[in-house]
């Protein structure tokens, strides 16, 4: 007969390690007992447990509550044990010694490695603003044993660079994602993906990009100049811009205060029934935390079209 085992066993920190030891023998052979020990530098070998075919499992005091048999059904030739709640101090070599009848004794050694899975963290970079050059969007750090893999998953065009720092039996990996900010990136997800053999699946942390920008301002409402005549009701000028954060709007008149009855409502300037006093240069001011923009238009209110003598055919925008 022979022992079926594994010379390398890997377990995740905090989980149960199965230390395999199965005797593959002839049908008439029996396993009397299996002795488990840890190969210890000071004491040679330190007993963990004794599995007896008749008397069952006896665990040494040092490993009380930490060693058990795998759940049933159990094969009488299977001397495997579970080491519960593995910690890094459990790393090392273990030995199973199988006493069989009539074939005698067999022994096998295996190495236990304990994986420490990472707990990744994502840190956004400084505020992103359109017009900046290559800028740090986010960094992602993960430390584990062995070294984790840190990558980025995104539709956004950018460059990733990583650095790692090794400690004994573990490594901290930091990956940075740099990009040239543009408004099209607003609201786009940037996902840090961390892989490690101690994780059942990749860990993903998503950061939503926010790029500050302010578009050029323009004014709508003067497209048909002939509509701007004395007596017209419901005339409005609308200031067009967009930004992140959303901009605030303000209206002024270049050559004096806004005429009475002219109302500012957000991005829109509303006029009462038009008179020639409403002619003038109007300025739309747009601003957010990033920047400010302005656009001005010249309004000329035409005389009553029913009075040809007073008609002025001039409306201009600049």
């Amino acid at each position: 007969g022979e022992l079926e085992t594994s010379d390398l066993v890997t377990v995740v920190l905090g989980q149960d390690a199965k230390l395999p030891c199965f005797y593959r023998g002839d049908p008439d052979e029996q396993v009397g007992q299996v002795a488990w020990a840890r190969v210890d530098p000071n004491e040679g070998t330190r007993e963990l447990a004794l599995l007896h075919s008749k008397y069952g499992l006896h665990v040494s005091p040092a490993y009380e509550d930490r060693v058990e048999q795998p759940p049933p059904p159990r094969d009488p030739l299977d001397g495997s044990i579970l080491l519960r709640n593995a910690v890094q101090a459990d790393e090392g070599e273990y030995e199973c010694r199988v006493s069989t009848f009539p074939a005698g004794s067999f022994q096998a050694r295996m190495r236990l490695r304990v994986l420490v899975p990472p707990l990744p963290s994502l840190n956004p970079g400084p505020p992103l603003e359109e017009g900046q050059g290559l800028t740090l969007a986010a960094s992602c750090t993960a430390e584990g044993s062995p070294a984790p893999s840190v990558t980025w998953d995104t539709e956004v065009k950018g460059t990733q660079s990583s650095r790692s720092f090794k400690h004994s039996r573990s490594a901290a990996v930091t990956s940075e994602f740099h990009l040239v900010p543009s408004r099209s990136m607003n609201g786009q997800p940037l996902t840090c993906v961390v892989s490690h053999p101690g994780l059942l699946q990749d860990q993903r942390i998503t950061h939503t990009l926010q790029v500050a920008f302010l578009a050029e301002a323009s004014v709508r409402g003067l497209e048909d100049q002939n509509l701007w005549h004395v007596g017209r009701e419901g005339a409005t000028l609308k200031c067009l811009s967009e930004g992140q954060p959303p901009p605030k709007y303000n209206w002024t008149r270049l050559d004096g205060p806004l005429p009475s009855g002219v109302r500012v409502k957000g991005d829109t300037l509303g006029f009462p029934p038009l008179t020639t006093e409403h002619s003038g240069v109007y300025v739309c001011h747009v601003s957010n935390e990033l920047s400010s923009r302005a656009s001005q238009v010249t309004v000329e209110v035409l005389a009553d079209p029913e009075d040809p003598g007073k008609q002025v055919d001039l409306v201009s925008a600049s």
Partner: antibody
Framework: QVQLVQSGAQVKKPGASVKVSCKAS????????IHWVRQAPGQGLEWMGW????????NYAQKFQGRVTMTRDTSISTAYMELSRLRSDDTAVYFC?????????WGQGTLVTVSS | EIVLTQSPGTLSLSPGERATLSCRTS???????LAWYQQKPGQAPRLLIY???NRATDIPDRFSGSGSGTDFTLTINRLEPEDFAVYYC?????????FGQGTRLEIK
């Protein structure tokens, strides 16, 4: 700084044994496994096995079972690899390497020539 | 055992060019368990990349590693004269530890 310094080149006759040493410095010797890797002339790297300097536990590649013995002396931070019943195809450079999952530091290598 | 197959066997390039070396594994290997080494004539191997993509201490950033599962790549941007050597990949996730057969990077 971390260093692994190996013993000098040796010439052996077929059937003899060779023992190569690997002295570690610059770190805690018992804190890292030591592996042995060999490289025949013009060939690639071949893993032979490891020793845990802390426990003295070993694991050998199947190919070398029964012919290789790895030992250590913690008092002088030195690991040893002994290969017996030498054949001409054991002519190679033998390296020791420190394991930190990967092999982050290597000895300079020891050329063992097996020739009658 | 896990078999690592490197390609090409030999790569002839000029300084300043980019080298792309491949390592395929016969079974899936966690990226945390894959390393790349550089070896120059008469010298010991030197760790370049560990965990598939992490540069070892003092390795220039023109060296980068990537890949997962069974396909891994070592890329060397802007080749320098000192980069011409033999490169090995290695898996250390299961026993026995295994190496690829190597890729020789030579000057064209």
């Amino acid at each position: 700084q971390v260093q692994l310094v190996q013993s000098g080149a040796q010439v052996k006759k077929p059937g003899a044994s060779v023992k190569v040493s690997c002295k570690a410095s610059g770190y805690t010797f018992t804190g890292y496994y030591i592996h042995w890797v060999r490289q025949a002339p013009g060939q690639g790297l071949e893993w032979m096995g490891w020793i845990n300097p802390n426990s003295g536990g070993t694991n050998y590649a199947q190919k070398f079972q029964g012919r290789v013995t790895m030992t250590r002396d913690t008092s002088i931070s030195t690991a040893y690899m002994e290969l017996s019943r030498l054949r001409s195809d054991d002519t190679a450079v033998y390296f020791c390497a420190r394991e930190d999952w990967d092999f982050d530091y290597w000895g300079q290598g020891t050329l063992v020539t097996v020739s009658s | 055992e896990i078999v690592l197959t490197q390609s090409p066997g030999t790569l002839s390039l000029s300084p300043g060019e980019r080298a792309t070396l491949s390592c395929r594994t016969s079974q899936s290997v966690s990226s945390s368990y894959l390393a790349w080494y550089q070896q120059k004539p008469g010298q010991a191997p030197r760790l370049l990349i560990y965990g598939a993509s992490n540069r070892a201490t003092d390795i220039p950033d023109r060296f980068s590693g990537s890949g997962s599962g069974t396909d891994f790549t070592l890329t060397i941007n802007r080749l320098e004269p000192e980069d011409f050597a033999v490169y090995y990949c290695q898996q250390y996730g299961s026993s026995p530890i295994t190496f690829g057969q190597g890729t020789r990077l030579e000057i064209k």
